[in-house]
């Protein structure tokens, strides 16, 4: 049993880091493998992650972490029984994939304005709370070409757009994702989408 693709990990910079790797053949990850991880710090304890299958030869493990900060560094040991298959390290702050924003809501009761709001996925005491920027994707269910992205570079988790920038009388969907420049993160996953019917009074044309 050998590791074909070494583990690569990403952290949500809050409580979970996800590591993925590939073996050289079909593997029952949860019964044959264990990923041990330990913070390089005074008094830290070793923890064991039981991987799950991710395709025939792929494995994925969700590492639970407390109080993740930029100084943290973890040692990783991948074991098959008594055999050490791979040894490495992982610094969560250098491989951040933010959590997806939640509670996306479209407020259509403001005259001729659409207000989209969502929730910051981090608590106020987390460093990323004040450092997220967002991308909002709006698309038409009727017209695949009617697809647009709005970049929200301010901190407030909201976006106002004129209803008239979208077609009237048809249904739209929106979703939002986040990233943080400070840690050069990847984009988060998209939030669940929300749907609304866009209707507004078009100005009378002469």
């Amino acid at each position: 049993m050998k590791v074909l693709q070494e583990p690569t990990c990403v952290s949500d910079y809050m409580s979970i880091s996800t590591c993925e790797w590939k073996m050289n053949g079909p593997t029952n990850c949860s019964t044959e493998l264990r990923l041990l991880y330990q913070l390089v710090f005074l008094l830290s304890e070793a923890h064991t992650c039981i991987p799950e299958n991710n395709g025939g030869a792929g494995c994925v493990c969700h590492l639970l972490m407390d109080d993740v900060v930029s100084a943290d560094n973890y040692t990783l040991d991948l074991w098959a029984g008594q055999q050490l298959l791979w040894k490495g390290s992982f610094k969560p702050s250098e491989h951040v994939k933010p959590r997806a924003p939640g509670n996306l809501t479209v407020h259509t009761n403001v005259s001729d304005t659409l207000l989209l709001t969502w929730s910051n996925p981090y608590p106020p005491d987390n460093y990323l709370y004040n450092h997220l920027t967002y991308a909002v994707n709006i698309w038409s269910e009727n017209d695949p070409a009617d697809f647009r992205i709005y970049n929200v570079t301010y901190l407030e988790p909201s976006l106002r757009i004129a209803a008239s920038t979208l077609k009237s009388g048809i249904s739209y969907r929106a979703r939002v994702r986040a990233w943080a420049q400070c840690y050069n993160t990847t984009w988060s996953e998209w939030s669940p989408s929300t749907k609304w019917h866009n209707s507004y009074r078009e100005p009378f044309e002469q």
Epitope: F41, L43, A71
Partner: antibody, heavy 116, light 111 residues
Framework: QVQLVQSGAEVKKPGASVKVSCKAS????????MHWARQAPGQGLEWMGI????????SYAQKFQGRVTMTRDTSTSTVYMELSSLRSEDTAVYYC?????????WGKGTLVTVSS | QSVLTQPPSVSAAPGQKVTISCSGG????????VSWYQQLPGTAPKLLIY???KRPSGIPDRFSGSKSGTSATLAITGLQTGDEADYYC????????????FGTGTKLTVL
């Protein structure tokens, strides 16, 4: 919000022991390390040791080895620092502080006076 | 005896800028992360800067930290009378057992 509530001031005689408590609230107690530091009157901060509330393991500054004991009670989210063989130089304000590489939150401090 | 050296005192007028230095060595500041703590008279220390230059929520951007080699600096702009306090740098000594250490402390007087 996070609160670290420490026990009240103590007056002890040389050679005695003192046990200071620090009750935590407003966060997951076992998820954060707890440090102890002290500050003698008019002096700077001095680190004493650290406890991992999850397993109860400890590490102490070399200066206090053999004289200090840190424990925790997860049922009450409280950590304790006991210092024995007290001498006049141990007169100080003793602080508990939550954190790992840096100390996010501090208790208000407990004044321990050692006097014959 | 702290191995992190700070000036005993600094002073400046309201509205001015002041810097406080923290000098260490390769086994501490040079190899670890620096934090800064503010201790107002009669109160417990409070985290001001961590990870060399980051501010906890609620700390105004008048406070900033930097690190270069084996020394670190705390800068305070737009000084206010409420900033009058003792300031301590902190880091980890990695020479033997990993141990937190504090600087000697600096008394800031707002004139």
């Amino acid at each position: 919000q996070v609160q670290l509530v420490q026990s009240g001031a103590e007056v002890k005689k040389p050679g005695a022991s003192v046990k200071v408590s620090c009750k935590a609230s407003g966060y997951a107690f076992t998820s954060y390390y707890m440090h102890w530091a002290r500050q003698a009157p008019g002096q700077g901060l001095e680190w004493m040791g650290i406890i991992n509330p999850s397993g109860g393991s400890t590490s102490y500054a070399q200066k206090f080895q053999g004289r200090v004991t840190m424990t925790r009670d997860t049922s009450t989210s409280t950590v304790y620092m006991e210092l024995s063989s007290l001498r006049s130089e141990d007169t100080a304000v003793y602080y508990c502080a939550r954190g790992k590489w840096w100390l996010y939150d501090w208790g208000k401090g407990t004044l321990v006076t050692v006097s014959s | 005896q702290s191995v992190l050296t700070q000036p005993p005192s600094v002073s400046a007028a309201p509205g001015q800028k002041v810097t406080i230095s923290c000098s260490g060595g390769s086994s501490n500041i040079g190899n670890s992360y620096v934090s800064w703590y503010q201790q107002l008279p009669g109160t417990a220390p409070k985290l001001l800067i961590y990870d060399n230059n980051k501010r906890p929520s609620g700390i105004p951007d008048r406070f900033s930290g930097s690190k270069s080699g084996t020394s670190a600096t705390l800068a305070i702009t737009g000084l206010q009378t409420g900033d009058e306090a003792d300031y301590y740098c902190g880091t980890w000594d990695t020479s033997t057992v990993l141990t937190p250490i504090f600087g000697t402390g600096t008394k800031l007087t707002v004139l």
